[in-house]
Interface confidence: low
């Protein structure tokens, strides 16, 4: 689509004469019609098929032609056409006579026609005006013409129609020749695509505008290069989406069981060594002069009561001293230089001579001991606490302070390593006596049940248009991610296409 | 005087195929365009298609695009409109017509049944 | 598509009589409208084209106006051999598209 346009410049009639040589009168008064066609070799009567067009009354025999001129006219004359500019063309232009008011063919005298001129040829589309002057025996016509395109067609021959936008189907602005210019942000053939966020993942992240990052399911992050692990992962990381990959040190299907808890707790006091034995479970091995559990009591040389015969210890810097009571001596009071005559059993104990007299014995009544009845029998000495428990004394009665896995009056009772549900999946739990077993129900296996050996929710291949599979471990249940160009939760449906457009 | 006679017209089951000739004289041939307009019984015109003989370039009403195509033998001054995969609607009187540049039909020819 | 609509679809008149046939356009169609007219078992036959424009051997009764989207093919008056069905087409955008026609009958 575009426009023929005429410029009228000036017309010279001097003697004011009708093509049949017969004098205007007053004056001839002049306006022009245009016929465009498509080229004749001879430019013969016809339909003009580019179009018509007619002045008003431009002037009296000779006269210039302004742009705009007055009287309602146009300069230049405008000859539409709304086909692609073949690029050949031919012209007639006729100078009537108008005697009165009414321009209307059928009104006219015959013989009204003052001149007519036919050209043909070549005419390429642009912005140049070409100037041409035509004499015939009385006349001269000097006039301009050109083609230029309709607005939104662009190209040689106004063909490449191209009008700017910025909606849904494209976001672009025309280039000279009719191409698409995108606008910033936008791309593809229609520059309908956006370009995304710098360094958006190409495959786990998308736009619907431009600079955005929407992440597809089981990513994260600013530009959707991070995965989001399993739901409850507590100590574990990702490679792909809803993975839960143990950290150093932990176990279990959400990588909250510590396997590692000398590490993570440092429970060992006063420089003792850890060492782990099991999930929550650990030894410390005391350095000397240090005992409990964690190492925590610092151990005094004269609790393992060293001095005997009622010798009393006294605790030194490097070691201990037992200072012994009348009849005898020895590093411990070991030796005696008493008999029975000397009355040396305490507390009610019943002496007996040995050795003809040289040694005695002392036979102690029930809560008392030592080798002379001295000691109160203390109530941690029989070691009560079973299971490696610590035995502390409180006043009139016991304690046993129990190691892990254990509890009870002495720790005589195993702590059920089945209260805590450890096996996952549903898996029933069996306490033993050197720890506990699970029995897993189909489609899992190992020793908590967490390891999916048979049901998988991706095993069927769900998704569409290969689009990656993931499964959900905490709901058996899959997740699709989807190339670019499809949605759904099974990536079956494209993404709308743009209507053709005409070029 | 300028003349467009057509010919190849007549009976087809629906699937079948078809070859309208159009024979032009009394104008250069290659300085216009050749359209066939179709007139179902008792109904109006179609435009269905258009050829520019020097190029060899057409177009096609959506109706039959994919079916039919136009061409040219300029060396015998005949147009040709070739159906493939008729349908019962594609039953009617086919016309060429000399298609000048304001894409007008100044000239046609008489029709031919199909 | 432009669709153009014709009306009335049929008519009755006399010789002598003025009738106007109307042509609307579904959108903006400039002056690239033509009208032909067409009798039994004949091909159509162009009376005007840009609208207005009378073709040649095309008696003068006939007459076209209208731009953009309403178009007239007026008969001053009507002649026995005007009894045929008339067409009008578009010719600016798209593919070529027809009226449904108007039928002249006598009355």
């Known amino acids: 689509s575009g426009v023929f346009q005429l410029q009228l410049q000036e017309f010279i009639n001097e003697r004011g004469v009708l093509a049949s040589g017969r004098p205007c009168e007053p004056g001839c008064r002049t306006f022009f019609r245009v016929c465009l066609k498509h080229f004749q070799a001879v430019v013969s009567p016809g339909p003009c098929t580019f179009g018509t067009v007619s002045t008003p009354v431009l002037g009296t025999n000779s006269f210039a032609v302004r742009d705009d001129s007055s009287g309602g006219g146009r300069n230049p004359l405008q000859l539409p056409f709304n086909f692609t500019w073949p690029g050949t063309f031919s012209l007639i232009i006729e100078a009537w006579h108008a005697p009165g008011d009414d321009l209307r063919p059928e009104a006219l005298p015959p013989d009204a026609l003052i001149s007519k001129i036919a050209i043909q040829g070549s005419l390429a589309v642009g912005q140049n005006w070409l100037l041409d002057e035509q004499t015939s025996t009385l006349t001269r016509l000097r006039y301009s013409y050109r083609v230029i395109c309709s607005d939104n067609y662009y190209g040689d021959n106004c063909s490449r129609l191209c009008k700017k936008r910025n909606d849904h189907f494209g976001h672009y602005v025309c280039q000279p020749d009719g191409n698409l210019s995108c606008l910033p942000g936008w791309t593809g053939e229609y520059c309908q695509q956006p370009i995304c966020l710098s360094g958006c993942h190409e495959q786990n992240g998308y736009c619907s505008k431009p600079a955005e990052c929407l992440c597809r399911p089981g990513w994260q992050g600013r530009l959707c290069n991070e995965c989001i692990p399993h739901n409850g992962c507590r100590h574990g990381t990702c490679s792909t989406p809803w993975q839960c990959t143990c950290d150093e040190g932990w176990g279990g299907l959400f990588c909250d069981q510590d396997l590692n808890y000398c590490t993570h707790h440092s429970p060992c006091k006063n420089g003792a060594t850890c060492s782990n034995s099991g999930q929550r479970s650990y030894t410390c091995t005391c350095r000397p002069g240090y005992t409990g559990v964690d190492c925590e009591l610092e151990l005094s040389e004269c609790d393992s009561n060293p001095c005997r015969n009622g010798g009393s210890c006294k605790d030194q810097e490097d070691g201990y001293h037992c200072l012994c009571p009348p009849g005898y001596y020895g590093l411990h009071c070991e030796h005696s230089t008493l008999s029975c005559a000397d009355s040396p059993c305490f507390n009610g104990g019943s002496c007996r001579e040995r050795n003809q007299g040289a040694n005695y014995a002392c036979e102690c009544p029930p809560n008392f001991t030592g080798s002379n009845c001295e000691k109160k029998v203390d109530r941690c000495t029989s070691n009560p606490c079973a299971n490696g428990g610590q035995c502390l004394n409180r006043g009139p009665s016991r304690m046993c302070r129990c190691r892990p896995g254990f509890t009870g009056t002495y720790c005589e009772l195993h702590v059920s390593d089945c209260a805590r549900n450890p096996c996952a999946h549903g898996g029933t739990c069996h306490d033993l006596e050197n720890g506990l077993m699970c029995t897993c129900p189909a489609g899992f296996s190992g020793r908590r049940c967490e390891v999916r050996t048979s049901i998988d929710a991706c095993a069927s291949s769900p998704c569409f248009n290969r689009a990656t599979c993931y499964t959900d471990l905490s709901t058996d249940t899959f997740v699709c991610n989807c190339p670019y160009g499809f949605v759904g939760s099974r990536c079956e449906f494209p993404v709308g296409l743009p209507p053709s457009f005409p070029w | 005087e300028v003349q467009l006679v057509e010919s190849g017209g007549g009976l087809v089951q629906p699937g079948g195929s078809l070859r309208l000739s159009c024979a032009a004289s009394?104008?250069?041939?290659?300085?216009?365009?050749i359209s066939w307009v179709r007139q179902a019984p008792g109904k109006g015109l179609e435009w269905v298609g258009v050829i520019n003989p020097n190029s060899g370039a057409t177009e096609y009403a959506d109706s039959v695009k994919g079916r039919f195509t136009i061409s040219a033998d300029t060396s015998k001054n005949t147009a040709y409109l070739q159906m493939n995969s008729l349908r019962a609607e594609d039953t009617a009187v086919y016309y060429c017509?000399?298609?000048?540049?304001?894409?007008?039909?100044?000239?046609w020819g008489q029709g031919t049944l199909v | 598509d432009i669709q153009m609509t014709q009306s009335p679809s049929s008519l009755s008149a006399s010789v002598g009589d003025r009738v106007t046939i109307t042509c609307r356009a579904s959108?903006?169609?400039?002056?690239?409208v033509a009208w032909y007219q067409q009798k039994p078992g004949k091909a159509p036959k162009l009376l005007i084209y840009?609208?207005?424009f009378l073709y040649s051997g095309v008696p003068s009764r006939f007459s076209g106006s209208g731009s953009g989207t309403d178009f007239t093919l007026t008969i001053s008056s009507l002649q026995p051999e005007d009894f045929a069905t008339y067409y009008c087409?578009?010719?600016?955008?798209?593919?070529?598209?027809f009226g449904q026609g108007t039928k002249v009958e006598i009355k």
């Open positions: 009394g104008f250069t041939f290659t300085d216009n365009w």
């Open positions: 087409q578009q010719s600016y955008n798209g593919p070529s598209t």
């Open positions: 840009s609208a207005s």
């Open positions: 017509a000399r298609d000048n540049f304001g894409g007008y039909f100044d000239y």
């Open positions: 959108q903006d169609v400039s002056t690239a």
